[in-house]
Interface confidence: medium
């Protein structure tokens, strides 16, 4: 588990200071301003290594280069959502980590990077286009994913491209939705600021409204839009996967998994208790994700020897700066 670097919660002025309308007018610009300021092009990086052990393990490392707070990370094998893939692990900053064979020892490395050890024994089927993908759901950026295909063949007889071609993409819904909201928000913010200039400041007067109502209302649009942007994080894989993934997940999985487009053989049956776990009512993107994960319950990570390729006591450092060599 790790401590999560959350986006600072926007504290609206106390409702007692002005009416509900005035409250909305003051809070919304701040929400939109935060979204505008934090809007950037986040990137996700993926690195896969073969561990130098007789067990032939693979280590997948992924990181998110964005300013938002990460609410969910999903690692899959076999391709991105569009191409189909099989989920290997889901990591949540608060609710914990779930992993499925042949994944072993998924963990947070830093607040914005994760690592996952994969048992190589399961990866016994040959495949020239095996792809590992990492998807980061974050607020306010939305959902971002990067995939890396295994070192391609330079053999003209094989169909792989001659140079590594990383897939770095945001989900269309995330791009269009968040970008649209941000664009509209920034324009609306300017409009509000202009209008605010040309009108007298509201008089401070006690509000007759319940203190809770305006707060919930102020966040409601954010919750709705982010819930609409939410995409399933499990992916299906029809082309190439390790042999052990053809077996059912031994430890069960989240009850919400059944509703996601996973391979039929990979829909684990979770205990009924998971379904009864209430979704937290906090109106933020992180809360929506937490709710989904709360249903999933937690499973202790696979035990086994911690295989480290690098004796360096510092361990792999988190990626800094742009992709590639600094």
């Amino acid at each position: 588990m790790r401590t999560e670097a959350q986006v600072p919660a926007l504290q609206p002025p106390e409702p007692g200071l002005e009416g509900a309308m005035g409250h909305r007018t003051l809070v919304l610009p701040w929400v939109l301003l935060t979204l505008c300021v934090t809007a950037g092009t986040p990137e996700v990086w993926v690195q896969v290594r073969m561990e130098a052990t007789e067990l032939s393990s693979f280590t997948i490392r992924c990181g998110f280069l964005g300013s938002g707070s990460i609410s969910l990370v999903t690692v899959s094998w076999g391709g991105p959502n569009g191409a189909g893939g099989t989920t290997l692990a889901v990591l949540h900053p608060e609710r914990g980590i779930r992993q499925w064979a042949p994944a072993r020892q998924a963990r947070w490395e830093t607040q914005s990077s994760i690592s996952l050890i994969l048992e190589g024994s399961g990866a016994s089927s040959p495949c020239a286009n095996t792809t590992f993908c990492c998807k980061f759901a974050s607020f306010p950026e939305g959902s971002w994913e990067a995939c890396g295909s295994l070192p391609p063949s330079s053999d003209p007889g094989l169909s792989a491209p001659p140079t590594p071609a990383p897939i770095l993409r945001a989900d269309l819904a995330g791009i269009l939705g968040v970008s649209g909201v941000l664009l509209f928000g920034c324009v609306y913010l300017l409009h509000l600021l202009r209008r605010h200039k040309h009108r007298p400041a509201p008089r401070l007067q006690p509000s007759r409204t319940s203190p809770q109502a305006p707060r919930a209302r102020a966040w409601a649009p954010s919750q709705a839009s982010q819930a609409a942007l939410h995409v399933p994080y499990a992916t299906i894989n029809t082309s190439c996967r390790p042999a052990t993934l053809d077996t059912a997940h031994p430890h069960g999985g989240p009850s919400w998994w059944a509703s996601l487009p996973t391979h039929a053989a990979h829909r684990p049956q979770g205990p009924a208790a998971w379904a009864s776990t209430p979704i937290p009512a906090r109106g933020s993107f992180v809360s929506v994700e937490n709710g989904l994960y709360a249903q999933a319950g937690e499973r202790p990570p696979h035990t086994g020897p911690g295989l480290t390729l690098f004796p360096d006591p510092r361990g792999p450092r988190a990626m800094e700066g742009p992709l590639g060599v600094r």
């Epitope: 993926v46 016994s124 890396g148 070192p151 992709l323 060599v325």
Partner: antibody, heavy 128, light 113 residues
Amino acid sequence: EVQLVQSGAEVKKPGSSVKVSCKASGGTFSSYAISWVRQAPGQGLEWMGGIIPIFGTANYAQKFQGRVTITADKSTSTAYMELSSLRSEDTAVYYCARGPWYYDSSGYSSYAYYMDVWGQGTTVTVSS
Amino acid sequence: DVVMTQSPLSLPVTPGEPASISCRSSQSLLHSDGYNYLDWYLQKPGQSPQLLIYLGSNRASGVPDRFSGSGSGTDFTLKISRVEAEDVGVYYCMQALHTPGVTFGGGTKVEIK
């Protein structure tokens, strides 16, 4: 202990081809990258290409592109390197070596970021 | 392509004395993961090369602790704290970061004075 055993010495005519084998015993074969490195008489080491048997993907140094073919047979834990259109300057000792690989989404990949097990070498002489 | 330059070409050494070999890369070998993708190999006379140091500073299994690797980016050094007679041979550095493939240095021949 892992060992890589290579096929015996070869004498070839210019223009012909040579196929050198490299059989792994005593350890994992298919998950590692197998690289081929050659050393001309009195010269240094030169990487020719490599393959990751488990994925069947091969990659070659630009210098040898189109002339070298690297394959692997997982069932026999054997890798092969075939060099065609031989010339006298291809006379060298050819080594196979095993090592772990990596790749990442920024476009870096290596067919062995180090080579911890080496074959004994196969001498190929190209002479008319 | 990345060019690896080793110096000196030849290094006469006295047993028990320290020795140092330099390797310079035309491009940085420091990956964003914090590791330098540089290895050191020793090829003893009439033998296959053997791995000494990997990822810049990590000693390979079975390598005596008198061997150490250091450096970062483009400049690297292999040090032998006390040379022994069995250490003679040609030492090669190798980069494994920049594709296509890996690139070896020209080699440094270590011989007893």
